[in-house]
């Protein structure tokens, strides 16, 4: 029961972070104009990933597409990449977990099969969640360095009294849902990759037979394969071998976890 | 058609108050915002305050910042300017002017003005 | 502040000739966000109030006749009457459309020679 619930808790929390992680990187505002100490400006400036946007006093915004591709700089690209990928990883990984959830009967699939795929998907929100937590802080470092980059020269003098006032940029709220997004489908990955290792059948519990044979006990014990990685054929409800010669006394012998043929 | 009516306009002594309206008509009144702009007797344009859609943000030109106060009422399509402690250099013409939508913020829009005078 | 600064503060132009009106920001009006310049112009006749003639340094307000245009970028901007009309005597503005308070030039007296 605690398995299933770690299993469909974790897809939901992955579910809600794939879908944040995909708002942020569709939102506009990653870096938003500082207000703090600037000249009271008629307009509010902001950008995102794809495009960027002003919005004038008046309520009317305007937005305009990067619609180059060689002349974006090097990090905004990468950034990007890192998003996206995330967003195909996650994307896969929900597909995935979906046919891993234990309440979910599809024919007649094994619960190992199940804790191999819990296990991928689970592996693939984390890379998600690293993924986009990199591309958001990746950008928040460039937001920071152009920042005091741009408050060590605020006022650029252009020919005597003219002045430039430089617009600064601070963190817009696609960072903070990014953050917040890469986090919880990290967090889903790991309660699934949590959930695939009771789902694998840690042993089989089954009737060991022993042979008394001239004088020596040798204890035969079958179906003793342990898999507690998920990987390889589940035998945890299969009876395999249950019977065959029993000695006088009907001794009966149990694997313990030390036990291998 | 789009129009600007101010009122409340008149003679008032030094240290005295007045309250300007605009009443607008024939657009949302409530998706835009408004400025209040003031010309003295022969001279040149100063602009007053401005007050957003939502009646916030509101910005002032700092000098008369603490003595004048906009505000509005979208309910009744109205525009107000409460003036206290005025003084003889208030002497001007005031005119509500409409912040135009996709206009880079210019007044699209301006009443006609009510004359404001200031005088012992 | 910002100070618009225009000049001159009165022209006289012959009727059919060419009107230039300069203006000069104490500082940039081109906002980097968009590359647009903020800056309009206004003109008013006497008794009349302002009426919007160009607003973005360059675009005309719809009904505006195309003898008057704008240009212009940064700090710099002109509004340029090609053909003067008895209709065009007014006095011409520019205003600051970037950063509050949302000043105006001083204003620019245009008559008929």
């Known amino acids: 029961m605690a398995v299933t619930a770690c299993q469909g808790l974790g897809f939901v929390v992955s579910l809600i972070g794939i879908a944040g992680i995909i708002a942020a990187t569709c939102m506009d505002q990653w870096s938003t104009q500082d207000l703090y100490n600037n000249p009271v400006t008629a307009v509010f400036n902001y950008q995102g990933l794809w495009r960027s946007c002003v919005r004038e006093s008046s309520g009317f915004t305007e937005c305009r597409g990067y619609f180059t591709l060689l002349g974006l700089p090097a990090m905004l690209q990468a950034v990007r990449a890192l998003m996206i990928v995330g967003i195909v990883l996650g994307a896969i990984g929900l597909l995935v977990s979906i046919f891993a959830l234990k309440c979910i009967r599809i024919g007649s699939m094994e619960d190992s099969a199940k804790a191999n795929m819990t296990l991928t998907s689970g592996i693939m929100f984390i890379v998600s969640g690293l993924c986009a937590i990199a591309g958001v802080s990746v950008f928040a470092n460039m937001l920071v360095t152009n920042f005091w980059m741009s408050t060590a020269n605020m006022y650029t003098g252009m020919g005597g009294m003219v002045q430039t006032v430089q617009t600064r940029y601070t963190f817009g709220a696609a960072l903070f849902v990014g953050w917040v997004a890469g986090g919880l489908t990290l967090i889903g990955g790991v309660m699934m990759c949590i959930a695939c290792r009771g789902l694998a059948p840690e042993e089989t519990n089954y009737k060991a037979v022993s042979y008394h044979a001239s004088g020596h006990s040798v204890a035969y014990k079958p179906g003793g394969f342990k898999a507690s990685t998920g990987f390889g054929s589940n035998t945890k409800n299969k009876k395999i071998y249950d019977g065959g010669a029993r000695t006088e006394d009907e001794v009966q012998s149990y694997p313990s976890k030390h036990d291998y043929v | 058609e789009v129009q600007l009516v101010e009122s409340g306009g008149g003679l008032v002594q030094p240290g005295g108050s007045l309250r300007l309206s605009c009443a607008a008509s024939?657009?949302?009144?409530?998706?835009?915002?408004m400025h209040w702009v003031r010309q003295a007797p022969g001279k040149g344009l100063e602009w007053v305050a401005y007050i957003s859609s939502g009646s916030s943000p509101i910005y002032y030109v700092d000098k008369l910042k603490g003595r004048f106060t906009v505000s509005r009422d979208n309910a009744k399509n109205s525009l107000y300017l409460q003036m206290n402690s005025l003084r003889a250099e208030d002497t001007a013409v005031y005119y509500c002017?409409?912040?135009?939508?996709?206009?880079?913020?210019?007044?699209?829009?301006w009443g006609q003005g009510t004359l404001v005078t200031v005088s012992s | 502040d910002i100070v618009m600064t225009q000049s001159p503060d009165s022209l006289a132009v012959s009727l059919g000739e060419r009107a230039t009106i300069n203006c000069k920001s104490s500082q940039s009006l081109l906002n980097v966000g968009n590359q647009k310049n903020y800056l309009a112009w206004y003109q008013q006749k006497p008794g009349q109030p302002p009426k919007l003639l160009i607003y973005g340094a360059s675009t005309r307000e719809s009904g505006v006749p195309d003898r008057f245009s704008g240009s212009g970028s940064g700090t710099d901007f002109t509004l340029t009457i090609s053909s003067l009309q008895a209709e065009d005597v007014a006095v011409y503005y520019c205003q600051n459309d970037l950063f509050y308070p949302l000043t105006f030039g001083g204003g620019t007296k245009v008559e008929i020679k």
């Open positions: 002017a409409r912040a135009g939508y996709a206009v880079r913020n210019a007044l699209d829009y």
């Open positions: 024939g657009f949302t009144f409530s998706s835009f915002g």
